[in-house]
Interface confidence: low
């Protein structure tokens, strides 16, 4: 008996060949021999099976020998064995539909957990088999369950449904709800315009929810909110914000703020949190604002950098188109009675620099001895 | 065919940091999990982490957390295994292996010998 | 952690008998109707090689002497008839759970 797999929803062809290519007589019938369908002549004809309306022919492959019964908008239901009868054989195929879907919305928030349910008929004992877009494979029976989901799982599942040697493929897109980074620094020079950009990683027709950004200033003993938003249809409204920074905020996706100029007041990490409507739980990107500052008095010339830095980052002071006179891994650095021209301080990552200041020295009068 | 090619054997003091390479050929890189696993000598095999080369994302057994790093770099399909803090019975032979479906180890590198030796 | 438990340590067997290699898991490793235990054969100054996988699965290229059986806690590998070539240290191993995790090893020699 030959094993066919089916998806429940889609379309599936059983195939039955007489030994004779030419037409002939042929009926497709159930497991209770009700028929299904059959020919008379060159017409198709179907029998009381509940199958019948969505049972079909290709009629033009009928002269071939060819008689299969093409079935549409599969059901869990429609498997079991289907008898064809031509010449005189009967030849019999059965049909196990599998349905495979996740059990609540395709669209998830970062953390939650995927559970794919399988609907199979009875008596059949299916393993499922799925690998999720960034190659994890994952294997069960009844249930598949993905704990807990991050931004990389977003995208198509592919899925292996196999019985009795035999594989069906399901599709399963799934959206991750997500912004792009789970964490951003941005590096400025005192005074300069600082942008914090929050993409997402996902579109939505709609999008709606609200929004809030809470900052933890490096110096401050506590953090405090900055700005709420809202977000209705990809357009975003600010509800409040703070004075002192004075922050503007773009009216359109991805989600932008504008902080007029970077002081070291300001330098420490914020957490932007994102509630979208019908969902539970809150989408978050850390920010992280880091300053630096190059100042000369009297004949000290002093580097420093506020904000969140690792400790691995190096500080630098050097005279242009020299080697660096003082590097330390450490938020500030300074030279003594530097000479004159113009210097840079340079924070640095393994060699790459991520933020640099000039500053140029004057020279500073020696005091006359005595 | 599948291939993992991993770097020559290593010669370490205690407190130092070894870096091993796997570099993978013959498939598309970025779409199988690679775990690592040591056997010291005469000893068995213990699993110490695996990493997602497609996004970066690595997950380390409890016991090396804190000194083993996995990185990547899709440029070369090679996979990085940094072990710091490194002590006498650290020695033991460090394969790369591609997972099968779920944690089953199907394609294995040559394996890399790190001796760790005052 | 799930621990592997594999006996015998070592194991001597005449050239075409069967031999036969047990592992326990210190907790089931069964997940809705499969077993999540895979063995792994390895020659000196060689990696291991995948031989069974969930449970009874032959890896392909495996020769058909080679046979894997057992659920819940208690497996076992069996090789029917013990050819020259077979001669390693074979480990079982669970991957149901993170961290997978690994039995001690069984070293079949000829008898």
């Known amino acids: 008996k030959k094993v066919v797999l089916g998806k429940k929803g889609d379309t599936v062809e059983l195939t039955c060949n007489a030994s004779q290519k030419k037409s002939t007589q042929f009926h497709w019938k159930n497991s209770n021999q009700i028929k299904i369908l059959g020919n008379q002549g060159s017409f198709l004809t179907k029998g009381p099976s509940k199958l019948s309306d969505r049972a079909d022919s290709r009629k033009s492959l009928w002269d071939q020998g060819c008689f299969s019964m093409i079935i549409k908008n599969l059901k869990i239901e429609d498997s079991e064995t289907y008898i064809c009868e031509v010449e005189d054989k009967k030849e019999e195929v059965e049909l196990l539909v599998f349905g495979l879907t996740a059990n609540s919305d395709t669209h998830l928030l970062e953390g939650q957990s995927l559970t794919l349910t399988l609907e199979s008929p009875p008596g059949t004992s299916p393993s499922v088999k799925c690998r999720s877009p960034r190659g994890k494979n994952i294997q069960g029976g009844r249930t598949l369950s993905v704990p807990q989901l991050e931004r990389q799982d977003s995208g198509t599942w592919t899925c292996n449904v196999s019985q009795d040697q035999k594989t069906v493929e399901f599709k399963i897109d799934i959206v991750v709800l997500a912004f792009q980074k789970a964490s951003s620094t941005v590096y400025k020079k005192e005074g300069e315009q600082v942008e914090f950009s929050f993409p997402l990683a996902f579109t939505l027709e709609k999008l709606t929810g609200s929004g809030e950004l809470w900052w933890q200033a490096e110096r401050a003993s506590s953090s405090k909110s900055w700005i709420t938003f809202d977000l209705k249809n990809k357009e975003v409204s600010v509800k409040w914000v703070t004075q002192d920074p004075k922050l503007q905020m773009g009216k359109k996706l991805p989600l932008h703020l504008t902080l007029p100029q970077a002081l070291p007041q300001y330098a420490g990490s914020g957490n932007l949190t994102l509630a979208l409507e019908a969902k539970t739980g809150k989408l978050h990107q850390e920010v992280n604002l880091v300053v630096m500052r190059a100042t000369q008095f009297q004949e000290n010339l002093t580097c420093e950098v506020w904000g969140p830095t690792s400790p691995k980052l190096t500080l630098s002071l050097k005279l242009e188109n020299k080697k660096a006179t003082v590097s330390k891994q450490a938020k500030v650095v300074w030279v003594l009675n530097p000479e004159a021209g113009m210097w840079q301080c340079l924070l640095s990552d393994s060699g790459q620099v991520l933020l640099e200041s000039n500053i140029k020295v004057v020279p500073w009068p020696t005091p006359v001895q005595p | 065919q599948v291939q993992l090619v991993q770097s020559g054997a290593e010669v370490k003091k205690p407190g130092a940091s070894v870096k091993v390479s796997c570099k993978a050929s013959g498939y598309t890189f970025t779409a199988y999990v690679i775990s690592w696993v040591r056997q010291a000598p005469g000893q068995g095999l213990e699993w110490m982490g695996e990493i997602y080369p497609g996004s970066g994302s690595s997950y380390y057994n409890e016991k090396f957390k804190g000194r083993v790093t996995m990185t990547r770099d899709t440029s070369t399909s090679t996979v990085y295994m940094e072990l710091s803090s490194l002590r006498s019975e650290d020695t033991a032979v460090y394969y790369c292996?591609?997972?099968?479906?779920?944690?089953?180890?199907?394609?294995w590198g040559q394996g890399t010998l790190v001796t760790v030796s005052s | 952690d799930i621990v592997m438990t594999q006996s015998p340590d070592s194991l001597a067997v005449s050239l075409g008998e069967r031999a036969t290699i047990n592992c326990k898991a210190s907790?089931?490793?069964?997940?809705?109707?499969?077993?999540?235990m895979n063995w792994y054969q390895q020659k000196p100054g060689q990696p291991p090689k995948l031989l069974i996988y969930v449970a009874s699965n032959l890896e392909s290229g495996v020769p058909d002497r080679f046979s894997g059986s057992g659920s819940g806690t208690d497996f076992t590998l069996t090789i029917s008839s013990l050819q020259a070539e077979d001669v390693a240290v074979y480990y079982c191993?669970?991957?149901?759970?993170?961290?997978?995790?690994f039995g001690g090893g069984t070293k079949v020699e000829i008898k």
């Open positions: 292996a591609r997972s099968g479906d779920g944690s089953r180890f199907v394609y």
């Open positions: 907790q089931s490793v069964d997940y809705d109707g499969d077993s999540y």
């Open positions: 191993q669970q991957s149901l759970q993170d961290p997978p995790t």
